[in-house]
Interface confidence: medium
């Protein structure tokens, strides 16, 4: 499907609004430190150029690739060397190496200030004064903080952001209307970013075979009535979409995502009975809805898997003829029968089945050798089932904050070399699995919990890759994508770790503690908890609980005092001394 001008093709396909939004997202994800105005200027220049190509596809430079056009534009930024250091060296390279270079310099943890939410009236005024700029600013601020955010989905978030302001800035109580909507968008946005980051890590670190296996399992669960070839078609198309977005090809990605939504809606009968209400929606909503659609009902008459994959004498013949197809069909058949399993478990089962066939099809009596293969799955299935059961019991017993603290202690003991902010962020998010998944019925708990944990642990892997400090983390992150969670679960107290020297400054607090939000207070306390464990990795739960209870009492007391700062100055050293004694 060749076009004389790629930029004209995409401009016509996407329309001006989406084209400009996607180019802004692309530039903001590459040059994360550039000021907003600089990006808007670059986007306007690219858009004007695209329009000239639409008018005449033979015009000068219109035949250049999008990477060439966008890369040339990014390389015109005057302060590239001062702001980005060695990233400026990318501009000396030719395509495709230049784009690869830009991709490698994306920063998952950019040194950007947290977004502060202004007063509602201030936001509504800004929205009414210049709606277009207000929404561009949203795209820019999210994209630069989340350089792998799924771009077409970010356009959907921006549309919801716009709708929230359009509705709530007219409301009698603007804040009551707007703030819950913004909170929901923020939380959903963070979750969406983390999920997409795992998809990109899967493609970039483990290859498209790993991503395709994940997609076969997930789509087979969602669309159990679809036949294997149909699921495979969707997987092929979905892989192309995510490969493009993860590679920075955001215009192609958005265009292909729209094509995939169109295909699914035109072929609902052979895919799923659940697509109908998605397909009545406008494009951005439709694509989002299709991605989140609930699992269709399983066909009633599915035969036993054992007949084709264990009892048949042709198993090794079928495997030998086309290994990937046979394993793909096994994964499809297993997944469509098990919406109650996590995708990662299904992939482990497929791996175990493959390993058994590799061994048994070379044996003297293959059938005898693989006859018990399904029995070997039992421990693989029970491990995540037990993990979910135990952790949900703990969550119900402790509540979210204390459950997070239990995980903080657990993970700090496993990998104490990891930075405190990373341990706090990751453990807090691991702890959110309780509220998200434990309330669900039994059949939905494991897929919810384990697949969510995979997303959170990927964040740990991504942050750790930037600043590697622990061989154990590197090993769990790089050896096997599907076994990451079991690998982390299996880690014990790091006996080789030399405890961190006690630093009183780490445990010195001030009156500003009292004005923090509840979440910020929790983060402060949890930061102290991690530091305590790093100082005394062998401290018991009881000892740590005692210290944390004293800490909470000390903060509460000083925040009630008339002279708060004096109280912190006097009581702080007492708390530190008492804590050291308690942990001695």
């Amino acid at each position: 499907d060749t076009h004389k001008s790629e930029v004209a093709h995409r401009f016509k396909d996407l329309g001006e609004e989406h084209f400009k939004g996607l180019v802004l997202v692309a530039f903001s994800q590459y040059l994360q430190q550039c000021p907003f105005e600089e990006h808007v200027k670059l986007v306007n220049e690219v858009t004007e150029f695209a329009k000239t190509c639409v008018a005449d596809e033979s015009a000068e430079n219109c035949d250049k690739s999008l990477h060439t056009l966008f890369g040339d534009k990014l390389c015109t930024v005057a302060t590239l060397r001062e702001t980005y250091g060695e990233m400026a060296d990318c501009c000396a390279k030719q395509e495709p190496e230049r784009n690869e270079c830009f991709l490698q310099h994306k920063d998952d943890n950019p040194n950007l200030p947290p977004l502060v939410r202004p007063e509602v009236d201030v936001m509504c005024t800004a929205f009414h004064d210049n709606e277009a700029t207000f929404l561009k600013k949203y795209l820019y601020e999210v994209a630069r903080r989340h350089p792998y955010f799924y771009a077409p989905e970010l356009l959907f978030f921006a549309a919801r952001y716009k709708a929230a302001f359009a509705e709530c800035c007219q409301a009698a109580d603007k804040a009551a209307c707007l703030l819950p909507k913004l909170d929901e968008l923020r939380d959903e946005g963070k979750a969406s970013s983390a999920k997409q980051r795992l998809k990109c890590a899967s493609l970039q670190k483990f290859g498209d075979r790993a991503f395709k296996a994940w997609a076969v399992a997930r789509l087979s669960q969602k669309f159990p009535k679809a036949e294997f070839a149909e699921v495979s078609k969707l997987v092929t198309d979905l892989t192309k979409v995510h490969t493009e977005c993860c590679h920075g090809d955001l215009l192609e990605c958005a265009d292909d995502r729209a094509d995939l939504a169109k295909y699914m809606c035109e072929n609902q009968d052979s895919i799923s009975s659940k697509l109908k209400e998605c397909c009545d929606k406008p494009l951005l909503e439709k694509s989002h809805c299709l991605a989140e659609v609930e699992n269709d009902e399983m066909p009633a008459d599915l035969p036993s898997l054992a007949a084709d994959y264990v009892e048949s004498k042709d198993v090794c013949k079928n495997y030998a003829e086309a290994k990937d197809v046979f394993l793909g069909m096994f994964l499809y058949e297993y997944a469509r029968r098990h919406p109650d399993y996590s995708v990662m478990l299904l992939l482990r089962l497929a791996k175990a089945y493959e390993a058994t066939l590799e061994k048994c099809c070379a044996a003297a009596d293959p059938h005898e050798c693989y006859a018990k293969v399904f029995d070997e799955f039992q421990p693989l299935v029970e491990e995540p089932q037990n993990l979910v059961k135990q952790n949900c019991e703990l969550f119900e017993q402790l509540g979210e904050y204390k459950f997070q603290n239990a995980l903080l202690v657990r993970y700090t003991k496993k990998v104490p070399q990891v930075s405190t902010p990373t341990l706090v962020e990751v453990s807090r998010n691991l702890g959110k699995v309780g509220a998200k998944c434990c309330k669900l019925p039994e059949a939905k708990r494991m897929p919810c919990a384990e697949d969510y944990l995979s997303v959170v642990l990927n964040r740990l892997c991504v942050l750790h890759e930037k600043t590697p400090v622990s061989e154990k983390v590197t090993k769990c992150c790089t050896e096997s994508l599907v076994n990451r969670r079991p690998c982390f679960s299996a880690l014990e107290l790091d006996e080789a770790y030399v405890p961190k020297a006690f630093n009183a400054e780490t445990f010195t607090f001030h009156a500003d503690m009292c004005t923090l939000s509840e979440k910020e207070k929790q983060v402060k306390k949890q930061t102290a908890l991690v530091e305590l464990v790093k100082h005394k990795p062998k401290a018991t739960k009881e000892q740590l609980k005692g210290v944390m209870d004293n800490f909470a009492a000390f903060v509460e007391k000083c925040c009630k005092a008339d002279d708060k700062e004096a109280c912190f100055a006097e009581e702080g050293p007492k708390f530190v001394a008492a804590s050291q004694a308690a942990l001695a």
Partner: nanobody, 117 residues
């Protein structure tokens, strides 16, 4: 009634090429995954290739990957198999077949391909 009619078989030298065609009728061709299956003399059936209705998802047996190309023309209700770099072990009766859910449900009569010098 479903009908599948293969053509294009014949005698060819090793390293040569052939193109098989399969004319389909009696069903909505563009709704079905289609495939080719072969049976060598004295051997069991071996599936060769499958193609999704859209033409975009294609599978090949490992033994033919890189040499055979399956394609379809939905406007003509026709399935094709382009066979290049043919070997003696490709000698077989080639059947065009319709795929339904978990297996092939309708087959043609077959066309014989002989690879010999």
């Amino acid at each position: 009634e479903v009908q599948l009619l293969e053509s294009g078989g014949g005698l060819v030298q090793p390293g040569g090429s052939l193109r098989l065609s399969c004319a389909a009728s009696g069903f909505t061709f563009n709704h079905y995954t289609m495939g080719w299956v072969r049976q060598a003399p004295g051997k069991g059936l071996e599936w060769v290739s499958l193609i999704h209705p859209s033409g975009t998802v294609i599978y090949y047996a490992d033994s033919v990957k890189g040499r055979f190309t399956i394609s379809r023309d939905n406007s003509k209700n026709t399935l094709y198999l382009q066979m290049n770099s043919l070997r003696a072990e490709d000698t077989a009766v080639y059947y065009c077949a319709r795929w339904s859910s978990r297996a092939f449900d309708y087959w043609g009569q077959g066309t014989l391909v002989t690879v010999s010098s």
